[in-house]
């Protein structure tokens, strides 16, 4: 690694802009919206729109703000005390087991099932069996088994990609 010093190399308090507010830690902790200095003597404010901290902490730097991905909309911006809130665009959802990406909602339920829940930013459409009322596991059905939500429209493989 090069021994050349860049601005990025320097510790957070050495790079801190002059306008960044400082205060003293309380019982070794700094309040939300701040981080602690390397020597533990100062609380340094996070940079609005760039980083944040949500709790009392002894972190050496604030947490980097999340940037919403393409396919997401920003519900609320990053502040010094709260991370950005991103949500999947209409027609897509984010699953708990794959939170890194928004997936397309299914356009309809498999044959023999009815839709009981709409596509939301956090869930796919919900399907239940007509007779038993039990939920469908959510696996994408084979194209020929699919009944679309608008009758008469042919099923499209493109709409099933997830």
């Amino acid at each position: 690694e090069s021994a050349l010093i860049t601005q990025q190399d320097l510790a957070p308090q050495q790079r801190a802009a002059p306008q960044q507010k400082r205060s003293s830690p309380s019982e070794g902790l700094c309040p939300p919206g701040h981080h602690i200095s390397e020597d533990g003597r100062d609380c340094i404010s996070c940079k609005y729109g760039q980083d944040y901290s949500t709790h009392w902490n002894d972190l050496l730097f604030c947490l980097r703000c999340t940037r919403c991905d393409s396919g997401e909309v920003e519900l609320s911006p990053c502040t010094t005390t709260r991370n950005t809130v991103c949500q999947c665009e209409e027609g897509t959802f984010r699953e708990e087991d794959s939170p890194e990406m928004c997936r397309k909602c299914r356009t309809g339920c498999p044959r023999g099932m009815v839709k009981v829940g709409d596509c939301t930013p956090w869930s796919d459409i919900e399907c239940v069996h007509k007779e038993s009322g039990t939920k469908h596991s959510g696996e994408v059905p084979a194209v020929e088994e699919t009944v679309t939500s608008s009758p008469g429209t042919p099923a499209s493989p493109c709409s099933l990609s997830g």
Epitope: E1, A3, I5, Q8, D9, L10, A11, P12, Q14, R15, G28, I36, S37, E38, D39, G40, D51, N57, D58, L59, L60, F61, L63, R64
Partner: antibody
Framework: SVEESGGRLVTPGTPLTLTCTVS????????MSWVRQAPGKGLEWIGI?????TTYYASWAKGRFTISKTSTTVDLKVTSPTTEDTATYFC??????????????WGPGTLVTVSS | ALVMTQTPSSVSAAVGGTVTINCQAS??????LAWFQQKPGQPPKLLIY???KLASGVPSRFSGSGSGTEFTLTISDLECDDAATYYC????????????FGGGTEVVVK
Amino acid sequence: SVEESGGRLVTPGTPLTLTCTVSGFSLSNYAMSWVRQAPGKGLEWIGIISSSGTTYYASWAKGRFTISKTSTTVDLKVTSPTTEDTATYFCARETYYGYSYAAGLWGPGTLVTVSS
Amino acid sequence: ALVMTQTPSSVSAAVGGTVTINCQASQNIYSNLAWFQQKPGQPPKLLIYETSKLASGVPSRFSGSGSGTEFTLTISDLECDDAATYYCQSSWHSISTDCAFGGGTEVVVK
């Protein structure tokens, strides 16, 4: 560059000071860590001295080691060595990457053997 | 004290294959995780910092992912030169948290 020195054979209980000499950068800009590795074992973090000179130690290392520095050296004092302190001792420069530190520049290490 | 648990302790794979190493932190360390490669008789070499960012000169065959308490190092298109021991470390991010290392994973390339 970073280079450790002072490793030798010592008897248990005899204090020992290891020195890390740096060149090409200023210790006033960088935190420095000490890490050790017993023969055939994994890496063990001992402690760190910040750019301003404040020291922090691993929970297990408090009271057993003391880290200090001058303008070009970082010292690690092993206060009362035991045979379990036999290891290669490394010092490493901590680079600040914007939202993370990491030990990016390491010395070759110096071997300490504690034996009666 | 923070404990880093690394698995497996040893893994073997053929040239061109892929190896995955896991690292679990006993508490939330956000994205403050580094990965190191060490060969016998040498000091550790920084591969990845801040969970997924490649250190200078490290090939893109190495990749890192995760956050919070669960992290992964993946080495794809394995080369003979990748035979080494790999360590995860909670990098310095808090004045009260140890910068603990994982126990190491020996990678054997066949």
